[in-house]
């Protein structure tokens, strides 16, 4: 499945709308830091597998979108931004899930499958958990936009990685 | 707010099939993993598995694979489960359940279909 | 797959009384995927405790959960006539997600 050119420039946008949503410097929230154990198994090549990958990409995607379009989101991030953020997750969505769904059935090893759709969950459910314990504080919501730049960047190159491939 | 929908109760023969639906409203379908959970009169809860509506990819409990098959479509907005070769041990309350994260997870279950086999 | 056995399987309070509902695991489960259920005859189930001991929304303040590794317990502090339902313990720590057999609890 070859993801359209928009697709990448789409990964871009996405990126430069994080980092506009930055509201506070960064060194405010020292305090505030946290490691959220980014499933980095799940991007590496060991994993090769290319349905498998869409399809981890499509979770990670998914998982953004549905973390930035809570209530709490909107009250602490620029709606202008965030409505424009969703507008670019959604044409990534779509991408990737024709690409899913033309690789169905294409998996070859089901419980490993499984294991990295759990682990994106996971990773989330951390960082959902975080922001509850933190009641959604503006530093919180700045450490959470920060690792979410650093997953998408990480989620960027296995793109690009699975193009090379081709 | 989020609703889910299914039908209160289906009469089946043992041997046959049945069909379960759960629609969906008050949210994007297609962000949301959708679960399916059964559970037999006076007993616990048992997870079925789940199905991603946006592209239909599924993940099933082992113990259900060759008994349920989870199907979206998309256009209505609704989930379904197929039930095969139907026994007595079938009988029971289906639930659909929407997936999510922290206090969203299973924070949606549907009234559930109570599935009744019988001659 | 990870086994939740819940005691004791039927029990009975008195209003005011202190209760202490007890899921075991059968193997390890991280209290991030530890969650509780409530329900009542006739109903589905309702969202109680999230992430070992957090309350749902609406979840009155007299409820509160604990525990790690194979241990967990939902403790009332105040039993009510409300609070009669089962309540279930549930995993998504490892595939297959599992519930336990569920608690009964009456008011005496």
């Known amino acids: 499945c070859d993801l359209p050119q928009t697709h990448s420039l789409g990964n871009r946008r996405a990126l430069i709308l994080l980092a506009q949503m930055r509201r506070i410097s960064p060194f405010s929230c020292l305090k505030d830091r946290h490691d959220f154990e980014f499933p980095q198994e799940e991007f590496d090549d060991k994993q090769f597998q290319k349905a498998q990958a869409i399809s981890v990409l499509h979770e990670m995607i998914q998982q953004t979108f549905n973390l930035f379009s809570t209530k709490d989101s909107s009250a602490a991030l620029d709606e202008t931004l965030l409505d424009e953020f969703y507008i670019e997750l959604d044409q990534q969505l779509n991408d990737l899930e024709s690409c899913v769904m033309q690789e169905v059935g294409v998996i070859e090893s089901p419980l490993m499958y499984e294991d990295s759709i759990l682990a994106v969950r996971k990773y989330f459910q951390r960082i959902t958990l975080y922001l509850t314990e933190k009641k959604y504080s503006s530093c919180a919501w700045e450490v959470v936009r920060a690792e979410i730049m650093r997953s998408f960047s990480l989620s960027i190159n296995l793109q690009k990685r699975l193009k090379s491939k081709e | 707010q989020v609703q889910l929908q299914q039908p209160g109760a289906e009469l089946v023969k043992p041997g046959a099939s049945v069909k379960l639906s759960c629609k969906a409203s008050g949210y994007t379908f297609t962000n949301y993993w959708m679960h399916w959970v059964k559970q037999r009169p006076g007993q616990g809860l048992e997870w079925i598995g789940e199905?991603?509506?946006?592209?239909?990819?599924?993940i099933y409990n082992e113990n259900f694979k060759s008994k349920a098959t989870l199907t979206v479509d998309k256009s209505s907005i609704t989930a379904f489960m197929q039930l095969s070769s139907l026994t007595s041990e079938d009988s029971a309350v289906y639930f659909c359940?929407?997936?999510?994260?922290?206090?969203?997870?299973?924070?949606?279950w549907g009234q559930g279909t109570l599935v009744t086999v019988s001659a | 797959q990870i086994v939740l056995t819940q005691s004791p399987a039927i029990m009975s309070a008195s209003p005011g009384e202190k209760v202490t509902l007890t899921c075991s695991a059968g193997s390890s489960v991280d209290s991030s995927y530890l969650y509780w259920y409530q329900q009542k005859p006739g109903s589905s189930p309702k969202l109680w405790i999230y992430s070992t001991s957090n309350l749902a929304s609406g979840v009155p303040a007299r409820f509160s959960g604990s525990g790690s590794g194979t241990s967990y317990s939902l403790t009332i502090s105040s039993m009510e006539a409300e609070d009669a339902a089962s309540y279930f313990c549930?995993?998504?720590?490892?595939?297959?997600?599992?519930f336990g057999s569920g608690t009964k609890l009456e008011i005496k």
């Open positions: 359940a929407r997936g999510g994260l922290g206090p969203a997870w299973f924070a949606y």
């Open positions: 199905i991603n509506p946006s592209h239909g990819r599924t």
């Open positions: 549930h995993q998504w720590s490892s595939y297959p997600f599992t």
